[in-house]
């Protein structure tokens, strides 16, 4: 029995080839311990700027100074490392810019050597120049989500430097990753800063974190591995997307849904609506409206853009993706604020992906 009543039906049309995506790395700012760091929020025309670190609101304190579009950290320590965001709240919309702060003795990543999959060359490191760990080749680490067919070999790399030479260890889902945790174990090639798992199976799915540390600091990086069984599979949606958003009346907002599907996916953006003053049909099922779907006349179905929003646009937006095998859907909420209230990026909480079995 259908779980909803469609207010606006759509027919399936030929769509664009499936998108295989990767998650990009935010810009990285490096500071040495004890130094001051100043970052300018790279957003234009900001009326109000709010800051977060690792998703938590950042306010001024004795070491953190927030002046206009600038964030200053005085006497930086490794604890200041993390993912920062500045949200510019304008009269009509809001925009968020993300960046990483890495408090380390490392020189800028522009001085990294080119990695040719061989051992990183640390011989030139001056033994007197003590350094906390730092990434030497962030390009090798940009692809965070790896969707790999079963039976393939997976290699995760975290090329790093430091003095003394850092050590590397690996966690799976936040816990120590032991050889006995998988049949056939795994290989760690310290000179390549890599973890290698051969012949992956579905139980290898999860988050893999490299922790690189020495006595001066610790850095880490997480990869997500999805093992695609060697049989047709349902669409996979990137966790955390679409993300909750807020804007003021008259503002614009975008929801993004990232899809991985070998089979041609059909993407629909759906919203709960009212019909004749009711949210539910005579059968007790909610009324849903298809706002956008992939097809010949639809550009970039992974993005739903709403312009000049009104209070009526507030609510839950569902990204529903189907292929001939099955479906997956995730949703996000739009909060529409009165014009005088400046919005901030909400904590990104989404419905659990339904593709997990």
């Amino acid at each position: 029995r259908p779980s909803f009543s469609l207010v606006e039906d759509t027919t399936l049309e030929p769509e664009e080839p499936p998108t295989k995506y990767q998650i990009s790395q935010p810009e990285v700012y490096v500071a040495a311990p004890g130094e001051s760091l100043e970052v300018r929020c790279l957003l234009k025309d900001a009326a109000v700027i709010s800051w977060t670190k690792d998703g938590v609101h950042l306010g001024p304190n004795n070491r953190t100074v927030l002046i206009g579009e600038y964030l200053q950290i005085k006497g930086a320590t490794p604890r200041d490392s993390g993912l920062y965001a500045c949200t510019a709240s304008r009269t009509v919309d809001s925009e968020t810019w993300y960046f990483m702060v890495n408090v380390t003795d490392a020189i800028s990543s522009g001085d990294d050597e080119d990695d040719t999959d061989g051992a990183e060359d640390f011989v030139s490191e001056n033994s007197n120049n003590k350094r906390a760990p730092y990434w030497t080749n962030t390009e090798k680490m940009e692809k965070r989500l790896h969707a790999v067919p079963a039976a393939n070999t997976v290699k995760f790399r975290c090329p790093a430097g430091g003095n003394p030479m850092p050590t590397m260890r690996w966690l799976k889902n936040g816990k120590e990753f032991k050889q006995e945790h998988r049949i056939g174990g795994y290989k760690v090639r310290n000179q390549h800063w890599s973890l290698i798992m051969e012949s992956v199976v579905p139980s290898d799915k999860g988050n893999y974190t490299c922790v690189v540390e020495n006595e001066y600091g610790s850095i880490n990086h997480t990869y997500h591995l999805d093992v695609v069984e060697r049989s047709p599979h349902r669409p996979i949606l990137q966790a955390g997307l679409p993300a909750n958003a807020s804007t003021v009346v008259g503002g614009d907002v975008e929801f993004v849904c990232k899809v991985y599907s070998d089979a041609q996916p059909h993407i629909q953006w759906i919203k709960h609506v009212e019909k004749n003053g009711s949210k539910y049909g005579p059968d007790g099922l909610p009324y849903l409206k298809v706002l956008k779907h992939s097809g010949i006349n639809s550009s970039n179905a992974e993005v739903l853009a709403l312009f000049n929003v009104t209070e009526a646009d507030a609510g839950e937006y569902i990204c529903k993706v189907s292929n001939y095998i099955g479906q997956a859907n995730q949703s996000a909420w739009l909060t529409v604020l009165p014009k005088q209230q400046a919005p901030g990026r909400e904590k990104e909480i989404t419905a659990s992906p339904d593709y997990l079995e």
């Epitope: 499936p18 089979a263 479906q327």
Partner: antibody
Amino acid sequence: QIQLQQSGAELVKPGASVKMSCKASGYTFRYYNMHWVKRTPGQGLEWIGLIYPDNGDTSYNQKFKGKATLTADTSSSTAYMQLSSLTSEDSAVYYCARGGLDYWGQGTSLTVSS
Amino acid sequence: DIQMTQSPSSMSASLGDRITITCQATQDIVKNLNWYQQKPGKPPSFLIYYATELAEGVPSRFSGSGSGSDYSLTISNLESEDFADYYCLQFYEFPLTFGAGTKLELK
């Protein structure tokens, strides 16, 4: 192992309706589409439609709209197809197949005859 | 609807032969194509998916190739159990559509 067990052969009169079943085991029934396919000597294989058991979403081949009705019961991991207003043209073997059309039921033979 | 033109409709071959069956779609189907084998009184059996991927348990003498709108199934070194009907299926767009089938007979 994955199995799709279909109901037995049917002999029905023209104008009647029939409801056949397909019981799934060995996988998470609700998270895979269930397809239905018709096989006749003259027409070969024809896709009738699909149902997504988790929410009851259906998609039909226009040719079979009004002829076939697909339903699913997640509590028993069983999919159903009802065929109405039967004629001799509906005599065929009907298969259910899991989402990727990778696993198929053994087929239900339908004969429409007076 | 996407039409799938399968050829030949029937063919004869000997044990040990190498044969090729083709399917042409009326538009680009981006490798969204499966191949099936069917024997009398049995349901179709899954051979190849996404045009080139061999399904679990299928002998390596079966292979799929193609892209765009043109696809083929090749069986090298034919064995006695390979004589059957073969169908292609496109799943790029609903309604899903099958080729008309190829009957492979022993010469």
